[in-house]
């Protein structure tokens, strides 16, 4: 059980107040984290509170400003990047968001040696992506879907690609579906470790169907936004990977890296690229039916001036019980011999663990094991491997950092974080300097987040980087809800849940219950993290009990739970929420006439299906930007879990799992449907179809659209959204305003 900072003295009670909706919307209780921008083994950059860029040397204890806030302000810079030779800094301004990760910006190059901006051969604008080489100060950038190279910032650019075309051919940047569902980055180019080669992806979207929606703006006529967006079963982008020698780019030009034969024989995806050395690269490919992944290690043949990918260096990862990997196929972390690597994949018991691959995947050596999962490999050095897992005390919603000594035999394992601040910190991530000389630990909770700096050899804490003192002080007079994380055992399934309870919670009383659900494949909602958000307010001020439940399909508890939803989305996720609600009612403090459910995106889909389950459990519910039919969602995501919407594959379940098919069942619940009209991700089409089905079934419901808002419903829409949902819930639960 995790109790938030306790309020022990009753005399304090009257000076304390509940959270307000305003607190949440103003971000009054938001926290800060500190991620060092590492530039060597012992140095990092950080942007100070007054916007100076400061270089810190851990070993000397010295710090100095490398770039003043005055210089930053002169071009309205919101971001920066130091060249590895420390001669130049790029300054980023005019940030203009595109999709989840992508944005365009204007870039200025500042010469640190003379304290002036580089004049002559300035960069064009707006640029889609820009980065320094890992060594020196070469620049690669993407402008109008083509890649350019500069040997030095003041040099004229060398154009690498010429076929880039808006919405047709993307070079060095992903198209919509690769950005959102495969790479999870704004870039699709990768420098080799010493900057000799530049690898990049080319995405051909020529044959992809286009999603078109109106953007209303302020003009007399709305604009139409067109995005090549492959929905389930549609034509997909065609991807090719090229590598160019950046020292002599005109000599042989870009060389294509071959796709493995077993992948090339049908539709496929490129999933990631990892440089091993300057002359060895590792590419990962995935069949369109995403249960087979191939990792291919390719070598530069000097005599051929091309990249050779021998069959002996192809490693196949196949899932027989679900899809390959977790949310994504894991990426390899290479060891110092530049051929063997560490990788997370399922062991024979169906738990994701670290394996060491020296020759073949069949002969992989398992490094971690147990009924828990290894989650991320942070760093491999000559003698240590650092990773995170949820092993400690068998709580799947925790993250601790471990070190395995790989230099000694047998390897020994040490938990670096388990006992550091045990009550406050149970969910960590880490950021390592070169050679893991030092590292930062960022603790996300359950207590107030804290970031600390550590010695990579001894794990000794060197200093606190950020402890959120102001937040701690601000919360001193706030009645925060209590939180507990527990589990239910139902029919051989473990359902972990987080319950958020009103500050003066009394088990003998009855409380309205709100279920917050996401429930998407490989997600996790029950996590030991700190948050003061809308549901905190609902518990603190409005006296609701809020519960989050991780059912079948969720992550980090083994493949049996994860792959249970394979090819049948919308069934078990809903069943498990319903099962949990029934168990909560049995606990005796839930008013069974006042139960609601809400969710966003995948959670909107699950909440809609739960409301339409016909159980009579829910009085009301909210779906924000829900998927309503898997035929409307992106191919890469949907087909990973559902297969294809064809007769000979899984069309039947595609049809059976829609929200529209259950329109009649909404008759006995209060339903609030919400969507942004400019949602590039889960298209407004989804809610339009739900609304149409409800109207056709003559079922009353409430709805709210947000004009020109995307999947995030940001800005003023956020305030309106949460205010609107609060009114809806209070009305549903008969709570006075």
């Amino acid at each position: 059980i995790v109790l938030r900072p306790s309020r022990v003295h009753n005399s304090e009670e009257n000076t304390m107040r509940a959270l307000t909706l305003k607190d949440i919307l103003n971000g009054t209780f938001s926290y800060k984290t500190f991620f060092p921008n590492w530039i060597s083994g012992q140095e990092y950059l950080h942007q100070s509170a007054d916007n100076n860029i400061v270089l810190y040397n851990i070993e000397t204890g010295q710090s100095y400003t490398i770039l003043s806030n005055r210089t930053m302000k002169s071009v309205n810079a919101s971001n920066y990047g130091l060249s590895p030779d420390r001669q130049f800094v790029y300054l980023e301004s005019d940030y203009s968001k595109l999709w989840r990760y992508s944005y365009t910006a204007t870039y200025y190059i500042y010469d640190l040696s003379n304290g002036e901006f580089v004049r002559g051969n300035e960069l064009p604008r707006p640029i889609q992506y820009l980065c320094w080489s890992p060594v020196g100060s070469k620049l690669a950038y993407v402008y109008q879907n083509n890649i350019y190279l500069k040997q030095r910032p003041g040099d004229p650019p060398f154009q690498i690609t010429f076929n880039g075309r808006e919405n047709k051919i993307f070079n060095g940047i992903p198209d919509w579906v690769y950005e959102e569902e495969m790479l999870a980055t704004k870039y699709a180019l990768w420098w080799s470790p010493n900057g000799k080669f530049l690898a990049y992806a080319e995405f051909n979207d020529t044959d992809i169907p286009v999603i078109a929606y109106s953007y209303y703006g302020d003009e007399q006529y709305p604009r139409t936004i067109n995005i090549p967006y492959p929905k389930a079963g549609a034509k997909n982008p065609v991807v090719r990977i090229f590598i160019i020698d950046t020292t002599y780019p005109a000599y042989v030009g870009p060389q294509e890296v071959p796709v493995p034969a077993m992948i090339a024989s049908s539709d496929y995806y490129f999933s990631w690229l990892t440089w091993v050395t300057d002359e060895r690269v590792c590419l990962q490919w995935l069949k369109r039916v995403q249960n087979v992944s191939v990792l291919s290690i390719c070598d530069f043949r000097e005599d051929w001036q091309t990249w050779d990918c021998p069959k002996t260096q192809e490693h196949i990862e196949e899932s027989r019980t679900g899809w390959a990997g977790g949310f994504f196929v894991s990426t390899p972390v290479f060891s110092y011999d530049a051929i063997s690597y560490y990788k997370i994949f399922s062991d024979k018991d169906g738990y994701k663990h670290i394996h060491y691959i020296k020759d073949t995947v069949e002969n992989a050596i398992q490094i971690t094991s147990g009924k828990w999962e290894a989650i991320n490999i942070f760093r491999v050095t000559q003698d240590s491997l650092f990773y995170s897992s949820n092993e400690f005390e068998e709580y799947p919603g925790r993250r601790n950092i471990y070190r395995i000594s790989i230099g000694s035999y047998p390897p020994s394992k040490k938990c670096v974080t388990c006992h550091l601040r045990k009550e406050r910190c149970q969910y960590y991530t880490a950021s390592f300097s070169d050679y893991a000389k030092y590292y930062a630990l960022v603790c996300y909770g359950p207590g107030i987040p804290i970031s600390t700096l550590h010695d990579g050899r001894t794990d000794q804490e060197i200093k606190i980087l950020e402890e959120n003192k102001e937040l701690e002080n601000a919360l001193k007079n706030i009645q925060l809800p209590k939180e507990e994380i527990k589990k239910l055992e139902v029919d051989e399934i473990t359902l972990w849940y987080k319950m958020i309870l009103p500050p003066q919670f009394d088990r003998s009383k009855k409380y309205p219950l709100l279920i917050q659900v996401y429930g998407g494949p490989c997600s996790q909602s029950v996590r030991s993290v700190f948050a003061v958000n809308w549901i905190s307010y609902l518990a603190s001020k409005e006296g609701m009990v809020i519960a989050l439940v991780d059912g079948r399909g969720t992550a980090f508890q083994g493949d049996k739970l994860l792959y249970a939803v394979y090819r049948k989305l919308g069934v078990y996720e809903v069943e498990d929420q319903i099962t949990a609600v029934r168990k909560f009612i049995e606990m005796g403090f839930i008013d069974e006439k006042r139960i609601a459910i809400w969710g966003w995106s995948y959670g909107g889909y699950v909440s809609s299906l739960a409301l339409a389950s016909g159980t009579g459990l829910f009085k009301c519910g909210i779906a924000v930007a829900p998927v309503s039919s898997w035929e409307y969602y992106a191919s890469v995501y949907t087909e990973r879990f559902m297969g294809l919407p064809t007769k000979d594959d899984n069309l039947e379940h595609y049809k059976n799992s829609t929200v529209m098919a259950r329109a009649e069942y909404f008759r006995n619940v209060d339903y609030l449907l919400i969507h942004g009209t400019a949602d590039d991700n889960v298209h407004f089409q989804n809610s339009a179809q739900i609304a149409k089905a409800l109207v056709n079934a003559q079922v009353d419901f409430q709805a709210m659209w947000y004009s020109d808002q995307n999947h995030g419903l940001s800005g003023l829409s956020t305030n309106h959204l949460y205010t609107h949902m609060t009114h809806f819930l209070k009305q549903c639960f008969s709570l006075s305003d």
Partner: antibody, heavy 119, light 109 residues
Amino acid sequence: DVQLVESGGGVVRPGESLTLSCAASGFTFSSYDMGWVRQAPGEGLEWVSGIRGSGGSTYYADSVKGRFTISRDSSKNTLYLQMNSLRAEDTAVYYCAKENNRHSFFEYWGLGTLVTVSS
Amino acid sequence: EIVLTQSPGTLSLSPGERATLSCRASQSVGYYLAWYQQKPGQAPRLLIYDASNRASGISDRFSGSGSGTEFTLTISRLEPEDFAVYYCQQYYNNWPPLTFGGGTKVEIK
């Protein structure tokens, strides 16, 4: 020494079936991709089918796709070619061949077995 | 599918002479090309792989060259045992279908 010995050839009528076997020795059979290549009387070489060392992936020439099935049994160090719906144009000497472990050229060949399809 | 065209179809030469055999690909195959020798009643034997590397046990009379679409097999001084049919094979990116050229017969003049 690497040895590949084909067997199972013979005379069959059009539409009938035949299974060819190739017994392999002198190398770690399960580590290598294998293939079948045929040669019609007086003609050149034609690649027929290939199989990965793991047995997970199989490939076929368009001329035999849907009629021939390649398989392997690593416990017996044997490669097979199941040939159904045979046609007159399938008449040839069928060679079993071991691919190089890095690339798909053929390092070693068997002596071949003759398949005659005739009415 | 990649088509390989060998020329000439037949080459009539005397022992001691130099033989030059050509193989042209319908599209670039990089360096992924092998040469085989086949004598009557025998199985083919690998001579050259990766366009220019000699297989083990192959005499240095045999050499391969070329890349992309144009390849050459050269036999520097023909010995009596060299009279046979020679085939080229592409294995570009190890992708099926693997294809062979039609063959060049080297016969005694």
